[in-house]
């Protein structure tokens, strides 16, 4: 015997209170697949999160981060503060990259300059806090 709930499309739930008819998801909820017994609460993009895509009856809301922050984690589960190029985020805030390291993005950590000598090359352009060194031809 086929489960009558399998006929309920996305955007509805199978309503046990009404002989398993398909009822529409309440406002601020959704069901992205058919045959669901309940709808799911829509994600709310509050505080440092902002709404990238509104919730609909068939799909959850999607959030991104307000300016000055960037997304981390699956589905932008967290927002992390941006730093300037040439900096990295520490527990005490944004700190300049130490000598010999660089960061060319507003996120992530400072990475060591390339060691040109490992490839038998010379340094063509010196590195900065914001840019890696440019290796030149072999001396």
């Amino acid at each position: 015997l086929q489960d009558p709930c399998s006929n309920c499309p996305a955007g509805t739930f199978c309503d046990n209170n009404r002989n398993q008819i398909c009822s529409p998801c309440p406002p601020n909820s959704f069901s992205s697949a058919g045959g669901q017994r309940t709808c799911d609460i829509c994600r709310q993009c509050k505080g440092v999160f902002r709404t990238r895509k509104e919730c609909s009856s068939t799909s959850n809301a999607e959030c991104d981060c307000t300016p000055g922050f960037h997304c981390l984690g699956a589905g932008c589960s967290m927002c992390e503060q941006d730093c300037k190029q040439g900096q990295e985020l520490t527990k005490k805030g944004c700190k300049d990259c130490s000598f010999g390291t660089f960061n060319d993005q507003k996120r992530g950590i400072c990475r060591p300059w390339t060691d040109c000598s490992l490839d038998g090359k010379s340094v063509l352009v010196q590195g900065t806090k914001e840019r890696d060194v440019v290796c030149g031809p072999s001396p």
């Epitope: 739930f13 209170n17 309440p26 601020n28 017994r37 309940t38 799911d40």
Partner: nanobody, 122 residues
Framework: EVQLLESGGGLVQPGGSLRLSCAAS????????VGWVRQAPGKGLEWVSA????????YYAESVKGRFTISRDNAKNTLYLQMSSLRAEDTAVYYC???????????????RGQGTQVTVSS
């Protein structure tokens, strides 16, 4: 036991107005998310309007925005739907509904009343 008793429906001409009432017992309308669903002849249920987030926000279906207003009287434990500029397509049975949030994040709703018939016709 939760009970919802709708009233205020009737026959009205296009462009006319009605106010539906829903007297609730067994729960407090000011402490719950509540609203109105309707069922037009031969069609499924459709959400019309709701008061959400314990009164922090309201929802209206696109088809009724600017024409319908949801409100409640906490002292009378009653929910209202003021309907104006009524159209033939608003003809339906209107049910008061209580949104139910289940453990684990599921959402459904209860309609315990018999509904009230609204017919818009000239």
């Amino acid at each position: 036991e939760v009970q919802l008793l709708e009233s205020g429906g009737g026959l009205v001409q296009p462009g006319g107005s009605l106010r539906l009432s829903c007297a609730a017992s067994g729960f407090t309308v000011s402490a719950e998310d509540v609203g109105w669903v309707r069922q037009a002849p031969g069609k499924g249920l459709e959400w019309v309007s709701a008061i959400l987030d314990k009164g922090g926000s309201t929802y209206y279906a696109e088809s009724v925005k600017g024409r319908f207003t949801i409100s409640r009287d906490n002292a009378k434990n009653t929910l209202y739907l003021q309907m104006s500029s009524l159209r033939a397509e608003d003809t339906a049975v209107y049910y008061c509904a209580r949104i139910v949030y289940h453990a684990g994040g599921g959402v459904t709703f209860d309609t315990r009343g018999q509904g009230t018939q609204v017919t818009v016709s000239s």
